[in-house]
Amino acid sequence: QFLKEGQLAAGTCEIVTLDRDSSQPRIEERSQTARCACRKGQIAGTTRARPACVDARIIKTKQWCDMLPCLEGEGCDLLINRSGWTCTQPGGRIKTTTVS
C-alpha cells in the first residue's frame, strides 16, 4: 500500500510544529505536538520518550508506566493519584511528566 504525501503509516507518530499567530504583535507561540495514525484499540501516548501509539487501556486505567515512557535503563514510577509519571535516570535525576 502506497502512502500519499503527509499520510502516516498505521501505528506510527510524528512530531508536528504548530505556529499560532496571536492577535497581539510579537506574541507568537509555537507548540509542538504529536500526530499519530493509531490502529483500533490504540491511542497516542509515549514510549521510550517519543510519541507512540499505545494500548488505549493503559490510558483508561492511567497505568502510564505500561507505555514504557522512559528511556531504556531508566525507572518509571506513577505520580500520586496517577496524574503522570516520573522517569528516574541512572544516578538519580528525575524527569516528571504530568498528564492534563
Epitope: I80, T86, T88, G91, G92, I94, T96
Partner: antibody
C-alpha cells in the same frame, strides 16, 4: 502557580558557614528535582548541585565537600556553604530542574567580605 | 572535566536580522539531546527558552529555534527585536552517575544595533 523563593543571603566574613533556603510552592518536591546555581557579579551561571526526592544530592566537582544540599521539609531545600571566601560572593538561585530549569527563584545575594 | 564552550562570547545584530549561537560539549549530553537554552536580562533570573535541544518552552516566540545533538548545538534567533538584547546560556545535562549532572556554557551577550 509554580514558584521558588530563595532566602538567607547576607553579608558575611571569610570563613563563615551560611545556609540558604529555597521555598517552593505550586509543585511537590516529591515529584521534581531542584538545582542550585550561582552567578558572581558580572559573570556567567555556575551549577552547584541537584537534589531529587529519595536520592543523594549531586554536586559540581568544584563544590564537593564545601557545599551540602538537603531537603529539609516538603517545601524547602537548603544549601549549606562552609568556609566561605570572597570568591563565593554571588547571587544564588534555586530552580526546578525537570525538562530544563524552570521556573527559577529571583535569587538571594551572598557577599563575603572582611 | 565537563565543559560547554559557547561561541561567540558576544554578538551584535540589527533589528530584523538573524543571530546564531553555538554550544559545544566536551562529551555527549544525556540521551544526545538534553540541552537547554536560557535568556537572561540584567537583574533577572534566567528564562528557559528551549529544552531537549529543540523543544520551545511554553510562551516563547517561534523566532527562537534550537537544533543539534550529541555534542554540537545551535540557537538561532530570527527577526531579531530590541527586546532580545540579553545574555544567552546553554546548559547541558549529563548522567549524574558518571559526571557532573549539569554544566552551563560561558554565555553569549547579544547587542542590538
Amino acid at each position: 502557580q509554580e514558584q521558588l523563593v530563595e532566602s538567607g543571603g547576607r553579608l558575611v566574613t571569610p570563613g563563615t558557614t551560611l545556609t540558604l533556603t529555597c521555598t517552593v510552592s505550586g509543585f511537590s518536591l516529591s515529584s521534581y528535582g531542584v538545582s542550585w546555581v550561582r552567578q558572581a557579579p558580572g559573570k556567567g551561571l555556575e551549577w552547584i548541585g541537584y537534589i531529587a526526592n529519595n536520592y543523594n544530592p549531586h554536586y559540581a566537582s568544584w563544590a564537593k565537600g564545601r557545599f551540602t544540599i538537603s531537603k529539609t521539609s516538603s517545601t524547602t531545600v537548603d544549601l549549606k556553604m562552609t568556609s566561605l571566601t570572597t570568591e563565593d560572593t554571588a547571587t544564588y538561585f534555586c530552580a526546578r530542574d525537570n525538562y530544563g530549569m524552570d521556573p527559577w527563584g529571583p535569587g538571594t545575594l551572598v557577599t563575603v567580605s572582611s | 572535566e565537563l565543559d560547554l564552550t559557547q561561541t561567540p562570547s558576544s554578538v551584535s545584530a540589527a533589528v530584523g536580522g538573524t543571530v546564531t549561537i553555538n554550544c559545544q560539549a566536551s562529551q555527549s549530553v544525556y540521551n544526545n539531546k538534553n540541552l537547554a537554552w536560557y535568556q537572561q536580562k540584567p537583574g533577572q533570573p534566567p528564562k528557559l527558552l528551549i529544552y531537549a535541544a529543540s523543544t520551545l518552552a511554553s510562551g516563547v516566540s517561534s523566532r527562537f529555534k534550537g537544533s543539534g545533538s550529541g555534542t554540537q548545538f545551535t540557537l538561532t534567533i530570527s527577526d531579531v527585536q530590541c527586546d532580545d538584547a540579553a545574555t544567552y546560556y546553554c546548559q547541558g545535562e549529563f548522567s549524574c552517575s558518571s559526571a557532573d549532572c549539569n554544566a552551563f556554557g560561558g554565555g553569549t551577550e547579544l547587542e542590538i544595533l
